[in-house]
């Protein structure tokens, strides 16, 4: 997914609390430097996905691809796909 | 750069209340069970998360969104 | 301590233009969904607006939908009210109040600035 | 939108007396509920959240009940300083309207 690319780490901590894996999430956490009351607040939330089960996780999952592959999102990809090559094509 | 559209969302599941999310949820996805599943899992992080929980939870975002990885 | 200041009030002709406003302190801004709420004289209160901690939702009453706008700038802990069109009717107090992010009751408010318009 | 409708306004009571405040939403908004008391010529505070919980720092002779559509704000033992009006507020979502206030004086 093209927004997936334009901020990998969000993604990466996302999935990571919603698949409940604390594991994944601390190495997910260390990426952006998060400290331990940041990281105790993260678990917090991954305890309410783990609690509710595989499908609670599968739907909100669901969610967010949903919403990240909207027009909202796309529209908003593409458009910064399109600064990008005028950066670029200034650039030369 | 992150989705204003995501932004918003992960905004209103931490700082929004229970319908406001619900609400915003049901404009990509108005399946009953997506809905009913978002109002779980919000008041979940509400009862779970207290002022300085939440705190820190925005703290981690702002992290990520200005990460070099975003 | 935790505060808001309002400023930014005073007279102004029906179909002018004012701009509020507010600055907090005490607190870190950027995480906290702000309020305006207004009281004209001898009435009740009367909420206006909200704007989450990054702008990134922004809702309106039915009755300034349309001609305030609120914004706000985090690296100055500042929050502000662009008032256009304005009424007679728009005549009040305005107050900016902290939403808290557990219960999202206001929980701190403003001092008020007050708004008059009058030809 | 969900109407606020609060009762009675005004309202003579005597120091010492129990005082009864009610606030009635059109719809049902859960327990999302907040009773405000604003004192003359004051700024308005916080008096009561999510229906029945007491803000710090408020005396335990105020109280709060309801949820859905019905609620209740009391004073147990009403006191000079509670001179002031009283107004409920429902936040389940925007707007977030406010009832149109209770003026509270001693008899």
């Known amino acids: 997914v093209k927004m997936a690319e334009t901020c990998p780490i969000f993604y990466d901590v996302f999935f990571a609390v919603a698949n409940g894996n604390e594991l994944l999430l601390d190495l997910s956490l260390t990426k952006v430097n998060a400290t331990e009351p940041e990281r105790t607040a993260m678990k917090k939330i991954q305890d309410c996905y783990v609690e509710n089960g595989l499908i609670s996780r599968v739907l909100d999952g669901l969610v967010m691809t949903t919403i990240s592959s909207s027009k909202d999102c796309m529209g908003e990809a593409v458009q910064n796909t399109v600064e990008d090559l005028k950066l670029n094509t200034l650039g030369r | 750069e992150i989705c204003p559209a995501v932004k918003r969302d992960v905004d209103l599941f931490l700082t929004g209340t229970p319908d406001e999310y619900v609400e915003q949820v049901a404009q990509y996805k108005a399946l009953p069970v997506v809905l009913e599943n978002a109002r779980i899992l919000k008041n979940c992080v509400d009862a779970k998360m207290t002022e300085e929980d939440k705190e820190n939870a925005l703290s981690v975002l702002d992290k990520i969104y200005t990460s070099p990885l975003c | 301590e935790v505060q808001l200041v309002e400023s930014g009030g005073g007279l102004v002709k029906p179909g002018g233009s004012l701009r509020l406003s507010c600055a907090a302190s005490g607190f870190t801004f950027r995480n906290y969904n702000i309020n305006w709420v207004r009281q004209a004289p001898g009435k009740g209160l009367e909420w206006v607006s909200l704007?989450?901690?990054?702008?990134?939702?922004?809702y309106y009453a039915d009755s300034v939908k349309g001609r305030f706008t609120v914004s706000r700038d985090n690296a100055k802990n500042s929050l502000y009210l662009q008032m256009n069109s304005l009424r007679a009717e728009d005549t009040a107090v305005y107050y900016c109040?902290?939403?808290?992010?557990?219960?999202?009751?206001?929980?701190?408010w403003g001092q008020g600035t007050t708004v008059t318009v009058s030809s | 939108d969900i109407q606020v409708t609060q009762s009675p306004s005004p309202l003579s009571a005597s120091v010492g007396d129990r005082v009864t405040i009610t606030c009635r939403a059109s719809?049902?908004?859960?327990?999302?509920l907040a009773w405000y008391q604003q004192k003359p010529g004051r700024v308005p505070q916080l008096l009561i959240y999510a229906a029945s919980t007491l803000q710090s720092g408020v005396p335990s002779r105020f109280s709060g009940s309801g949820s859905g559509t019905d609620f209740t704000l009391t004073i147990s033992s009403l006191q000079p300083e509670d001179v002031a009006t009283y107004y409920c507020?429902?936040?389940?979502?925007?707007?977030?309207?406010f009832g149109q206030g209770t003026k509270l004086e001693i008899k």
């Open positions: 704007i989450s901690g990054s702008s990134s939702y922004i």
């Open positions: 109040a902290r939403r808290t992010l557990s219960y999202y009751v206001m929980d701190v």
């Open positions: 719809q049902g908004i859960s327990n999302y």
């Open positions: 507020q429902k936040y389940n979502s925007a707007p977030y309207t």
